[in-house]
Every structure is written in structure tokens, then in C-alpha cells.
């Protein structure tokens, strides 16, 4: 007697590893014999598709070599013209051992920047990613984090972060290890011991001593009154990444002697300078304070930004503070030519006020740092996009000069005017497009180190920068 088809073995979920065989069974009882068709995600599987084998009158579907794209719902449909067609469905879950699709690569990074070591993985179940530094599992902390993607992010890279790293991807089916990569931390040249100034008698011998460090170890050159040292003997020694240079001089005239420490980071150089004056007793002139002194700004770049006749702090760790600081701003401003019109005035004000800091009264001249709120406003509001780009370029080493790194303050290390309004300097000359102004959105927080608090209103300072935001 004719009998409508009945599926006696419904399809079940099948787990299969990549490159293995997976079989679905769809046992059917009927008379006459049914026609059985198969679909994957509602798309008909063609009988002649060589990736599949259909046997036992269509009751067995075999995927000959499973790929991760074979995931889906498979259905068999049986029909013999008696009664209606019947269908049964089951899922194929493709399981996959972990595989590292984007392994980490060797990285050279400058101390204080952010390093990201990639480690993108595939696998089912999704692999968990951990990292090994040297021979030990790497512990995450406030600076070091494994991102959702598996990449390792190290904020504010320190010398001790240098070493060999590898990532480990693990799931229930196995473990994959990346190759070992090297993180090299480079450090800007820094002078540890500056040469000291001397007031000596004519014909004395003086030894100027300059010690510097950096990674790679810097070289030290000596400059006398702006030219390479022509007389005197130089002795150098290097120990534990510290270079020690001694310049012995026979004094017959006064002079300004500058120790310049230089090291190379890719195509760029970093330099640190320290100067000492040699004066002959009867020629002696008053010495400037060894940290710096206050003077009216006489440069050009920051003329429109700094208050007229403002006294600014000039740092005597530079041989010629006015020239060096002006060059620092000039270099940074060149990078600003491409930023948006909303960002540019804010960034210019930040750079000028950071490099030529306001002077504070007192026995010893001291600079007043920029208020954290203004720094954060520039970083997170006016120049959010540009700041990210700049950080990205910095990590990839695309800047022509290391100087711009010195010209961007680290906002979190600046005092907040919320706690002491006299501890820091405002940016009063951010004055751009006064039409159509709205209020700075309030983001006051009990932790101003993170959020940008309201900038207070005051008749004496205006901070109206963008067409969208203003701060007073």
C-alpha cells in the first residue's frame, strides 16, 4: 500500500572539526521510495557538488572536508507524492582549533608611548588569548592589558617592558603559540649630570663633567660658544647605558660650553643639552638662576597667543632658552597646519602656554603649568580626532622630529584649577568664532584627573573656541 514518508531518524546537531568529515543521516520510511533533497541555510545542495557525498538513496549527506564556512542549518526533505513532504533539520557547528591569524611582530617603541602587539585569532569555541613575557605568564595591570581582540596594549611603556613576548591562543580543542617577538624600548637622550659653571682665575684648568643616558646609548658632543670644541681633551666611558664625558680645558677666555647628548630612533634623533659658563674672575657677570629665569616673550610664533608683555619662563637647561623654546613651538606648529579649524587655535594656545609657561612671582622664578581642565578640553574636545591621529603617528614613528613629543603636555600630570585655581594657568587667548556658541557640556566629576570639569566662569578669562562650544 502507498505510504506517506516518515522521517524515522530526525537530524541532530553535528559538531565537526575543520578538514574533517561530517555526516547527517535522514532515515525515511515510505512507499514508493521518496525523493530526498538537502538544503543548507534554505539553499538547495546540488547533487553534483563535489564537496558533498549523498548516498543511501539520499539518506546520508557527507561533507567531505569541513570548512569553517560550512556552519549552518542543514535540512532534508522527503517526498513520494503520497501525503505531504516531510522535513527534518539539524545544525552543523564547525569546531576549530585555535589559529593565530595576525601574529605579533617585533616592535621598537619610545619610552612613555603606547605599544600594541597584535594577536588576532580564529577558533571555535572562541580562543582565550594570554601572553608570555620571557618564560613567565604576563600579568595585566593598570598599564598592561590584553584587549578583546587579543592584542597586547602597554600604556606609558617603561624600560622594564623590553623583552621577548609571545601570545597563546587556547580553546577546548587545543593551543596555538605565536612566534617569539621582541619589544625594544628606546629612551630619549637625557642628561643625568649637567656640567657646572665655574668662575676661575685666568690660566686655570677646569674639567667639565657631563653624564647622559638613553637607549640606544647617546653620543656626547661639546660645543664652545656655538662651535665645536677646538681645544681641550675629552675622555669618555660607557657603563650600564650611561655615557660619561669629561672635557678638560685650559682657561684663557670666558665661554659658554654646551654638552649635547644625541641618540637615534629610526630616522629621527633626540637630543638633550646642558650648558655651563666659564667666567674669569675679573670678567664675572651675574649668573642666571640655574633652573631658569623670567623674561618678556620676544618671539614671533606665539605672539598672537600669549598675553601682551607676558613674562614667560625660560628654561636654562637649554643653552639659548629663547631660541630653543621658540624652535620647539615652531616645529610643533608645522605639524598643526593640517588640523581642523576648530582644533588649531586650541592646540596653538596649548602648545605656546606649555612651552612658554607663565611665570610665578617669588624668590626663585618658577613656571606655572597649564590647568589640567584646559589641557583635557583641547585633547578630548577640540582636538579629539587629531590627538588620536598624532598618537597613532607617534607610535608608527612618522614624525620628522622628536620635538613635538615635548610640546604636548601629559594632561594627567597637570594640576587642576578645581582644587587650586592659583596652581595653574588658564588659556585665555583661545578666542575663535564667537557666533553661535553653546555651553561646554557639564562633565563635573569627583575625580577631575579623568573627567573634564566645568571650566569656571570669570570675567577675566574667556575660552571660546569652537562654533559648538565655549568656555568662560
Amino acid at each position: 500500500l502507498p505510504k506517506a514518508p516518515v522521517i524515522t531518524t530526525p537530524l541532530e546537531t553535528v559538531d565537526a572539526l575543520v578538514e574533517e568529515v561530517a555526516t547527517f543521516m535522514c532515515a525515511v520510511e515510505s512507499y514508493p521510495q521518496p525523493e530526498i533533497s538537502w538544503t543548507r541555510n534554505k539553499i538547495l545542495i546540488k547533487l553534483f557538488d563535489t564537496r558533498y557525498s549523498i548516498r543511501e538513496n539520499g539518506q546520508l549527506l557527507t561533507i567531505l572536508s569541513v570548512e569553517d564556512s560550512d556552519d549552518g542549518i542543514y535540512c532534508c526533505t522527503a517526498n513520494n507524492g503520497v501525503g505531504g513532504a516531510v522535513e527534518s533539520c539539524g545544525a552543523l557547528q564547525v569546531k576549530m582549533k585555535p589559529k593565530i591569524t595576525r601574529p605579533p611582530i617585533n616592535v621598537k617603541i619610545i619610552e612613555g608611548l603606547k605599544a600594541v602587539l597584535p594577536c588576532t585569532t580564529m577558533g571555535n569555541p572562541k580562543p582565550s588569548v594570554s601572553w608570555i613575557k620571557g618564560d613567565s605568564p604576563l600579568r595585566e595591570n593598570s598599564r598592561i592589558a590584553v584587549l578583546e581582540s587579543g592584542s597586547l596594549r602597554i600604556h606609558n611603556v617603561q624600560k622594564e617592558d623590553a623583552g621577548q613576548y609571545r601570545c597563546v591562543a587556547k580553546n577546548s580543542l587545543g593551543t596555538a603559540y605565536s612566534k617569539v617577538v621582541k619589544l625594544e624600548v628606546e629612551v630619549f637622550a637625557r642628561i643625568l649630570r649637567a656640567p657646572e659653571s665655574h668662575n676661575v682665575t685666568f690660566g686655570s684648568f677646569v674639567t667639565l663633567h657631563c653624564t647622559a643616558t638613553g637607549i640606544p646609548v647617546p653620543t656626547i658632543t661639546w660645543i664652545e660658544n656655538g662651535n665645536a670644541v677646538s681645544s681641550g681633551s675629552i675622555q669618555e666611558s660607557v657603563k650600564d647605558r650611561v655615557i660619561d664625558s669629561r672635557l678638560q680645558l685650559f682657561i684663557t677666555k670666558p665661554g659658554l660650553y654646551t654638552c649635547i647628548a644625541t641618540n637615534k630612533h629610526g630616522e629621527k634623533f633626540s637630543t638633550a643639552k646642558a650648558a655651563a659658563t666659564i667666567s674669569i674672575a675679573e670678567w664675572s657677570k651675574p649668573q642666571k638662576d640655574n633652573k631658569g629665569y623670567c623674561a618678556q616673550y620676544r618671539g614671533e610664533v606665539c605672539n598672537a597667543v600669549l598675553a601682551k608683555d607676558a613674562l614667560v619662563f625660560l628654561n636654562t637647561s637649554y643653552a639659548d632658552p629663547e631660541e630653543a623654546q621658540e624652535l620647539l613651538v615652531h616645529t610643533a606648529w608645522n605639524e598643526l597646519k593640517v588640523v581642523s579649524p576648530v582644533c588649531r587655535p586650541a592646540a596653538e594656545a596649548l602648545l605656546c602656554n606649555h612651552i612658554f609657561q607663565e611665570c610665578s612671582p617669588g624668590v626663585v622664578p618658577t613656571p606655572i603649568p597649564i590647568c589640567r581642565e584646559y589641557c583635557l578640553a583641547v585633547k578630548e574636545l577640540f582636538c579629539a580626532k587629531e590627538w588620536l591621529v598624532m598618537e597613532e603617528k607617534t607610535h608608527r614613528g612618522l614624525y620628522r622630529s622628536e620635538m613635538h613629543l615635548l610640546s604636548v603636555p601629559e594632561c594627567s600630570k597637570l594640576p587642576s584649577m578645581h582644587w587650586d585655581p592659583t596652581a595653574c594657568a588658564r588659556l585665555p587667548h583661545l578666542d575663535y568664532n564667537k557666533e553661535n556658541l553653546k555651553t561646554f557640556p557639564p562633565m563635573t566629576s569627583s575625580k577631575p584627573s579623568v573627567d573634564i570639569p566645568n571650566l569656571p566662569s570669570s570675567s577675566s578669562s574667556s575660552f571660546s573656541v569652537s562654533p559648538t562650544y565655549s568656555m568662560t
Epitope: 610665578s360 612671582p361 596652581a423 577675566s460
Partner: antibody, heavy 115, light 111 residues
């Protein structure tokens, strides 16, 4: 919220010593100048000392050589060491945050110098 | 050291009345376009509280009836409409040079 909590005051004999402490919270202590100011009973305010962010200290002439200000940025604590105390040092001693204006004040700790 | 002379030493006022307190410095406290002079209020039994810094900038949270003015050596604190809660001693202070110094104080009482 900034909090400055002074402690260490008490009764001491002339010529004696005391050490005052001020525990700061609610702000990044290391980034700010800190001061000590005192107020004798029924009298006005007298500034004593300031310490900057590099731990360079300045003093009023009346306490120079006898009092020492210091700070521990790890413990968020300001100190004032009082030596060779005199009866005229009797006062309420305040710990104050501020660079050129005295912005946030503690509640004070009482120092009494008497035989 | 810089000496600050405050006047008057005491003043009695009615609610709603305008009150002015003066502070004279023995030398200029003007530096880099700022006057380094501050005003404080000390209510009975309380710690002092900063009202005005840089001679004329009101500290956040201070009612706008308080204002500061003056430059170089002569400064004034004005309460435009005296309120009972303004009963206190008011001090001026210079932050121009160490040692920082205070005025002797002005006691403000209600009629």
C-alpha cells in the same frame, strides 16, 4: 572632595618638640603646593611655611630654624616638625592647600606650649 | 616682608547694606598682569574660607554679592548686600612673595 585632616597637636613644655601631620585626600597631592598657617587664641592668621611640588620649602622669619615642613607624596601627607617650642607658639595649626592663595583649609590641630 | 594694613578693624552693618573693607600693601603685589592678593572669611568657630583670589576673581561657590577690586597696592572687598550669615572676620593676604602675609583682619557684625 578635598579633605585635609591635621593631627599630632597637644600639650608640650617650652623647649619641647611636636610633629604635626596632615593627611590629604580627594586630589593628586603631589601636584600642589602645601602650607601651614596658625592662629593664636583670639588673634589673626599667621602664615608659617610653604612647600612646593619639588619639596623646596620657605618659612616665616618667626619659625625659621625651629620648624621644618616636609611632604610624603606616596602617603599623601604633609608634616610640620616643631622644635624648641615657645609659649607664643600656642595656636591652632592649619594645613592649607594653595600656591599663592590659600584655597582649601583643614579643621586645624591645637598646639599648647605651657609649663 | 610685605605688610598689609586692613581697615576698618571692625564694622557693624544692617542686612541689605553695602559693606567695604580696605587692604593696603606696603609694596606692589602686581606681577605678570596679576595682583597676588586674596580675601578670606572666617566665621566664628570655623576654618577660614577663600573668597577672592588675584584681587578680583571670585572662588567657585562664593555668592556674587562678594566682589574684589583694586590694583598694585590698594585693594577693596565689597559685600553688595550684607546678610546675617556674613558675620565673620575678613582677612586679606598677599601671595606675591614669601613670607606670605595677612592683614590684621576686619570684624563684621550685624546691627
Amino acid at each position: 572632595e578635598v579633605q585635609l585632616v591635621e593631627s599630632g597637636g597637644g600639650l608640650v613644655q617650652p623647649g619641647g618638640s611636636l610633629s604635626l601631620s596632615c593627611v590629604a585626600s580627594g586630589f593628586t597631592f603631589s601636584l600642589y603646593y602645601m602650607n601651614w598657617v596658625r592662629q593664636a587664641p583670639g588673634k589673626g592668621l599667621e602664615w608659617l611655611s610653604v612647600i612646593d611640588t619639588h619639596s623646596i620649602a620657605y618659612y616665616a622669619d618667626s619659625v625659621k630654624g625651629r620648624f621644618t615642613i616636609s611632604r610624603d607624596n606616596v602617603k599623601n601627607t604633609l608634616y610640620l616638625q616643631l622644635n624648641n617650642l615657645k609659649p607664643e607658639d600656642t595656636a591652632l595649626y592649619y594645613c592649607v592647600l594653595g600656591r599663592t592663595a590659600l584655597v582649601r583649609w583643614g579643621q586645624g590641630t591645637q598646639v599648647t606650649v605651657s609649663s | 616682608e610685605i605688610v598689609l594694613t586692613q581697615s576698618p578693624s571692625s564694622v557693624t552693618a544692617s542686612a541689605g547694606e553695602k559693606v567695604t573693607i580696605n587692604c593696603k600693601s606696603s609694596q606692589s603685589v602686581l606681577y605678570n598682569q596679576k595682583n597676588y592678593l586674596a580675601w578670606y572669611q572666617q566665621r566664628p568657630g570655623q576654618s577660614p574660607r577663600l573668597l577672592i583670589y588675584w584681587a578680583s576673581t571670585r572662588e567657585s561657590g562664593v555668592p556674587d554679592r562678594f566682589s574684589g577690586s583694586g590694583s598694585t597696592t590698594d585693594f577693596t572687598l565689597t559685600i553688595s548686600s550684607f546678610q546675617p550669615e556674613d558675620v565673620a572676620v575678613y582677612y586679606c593676604q598677599q601671595g606675591y612673595s614669601v613670607p606670605y602675609t595677612f592683614g590684621s583682619g576686619t570684624r563684621l557684625e550685624i546691627k
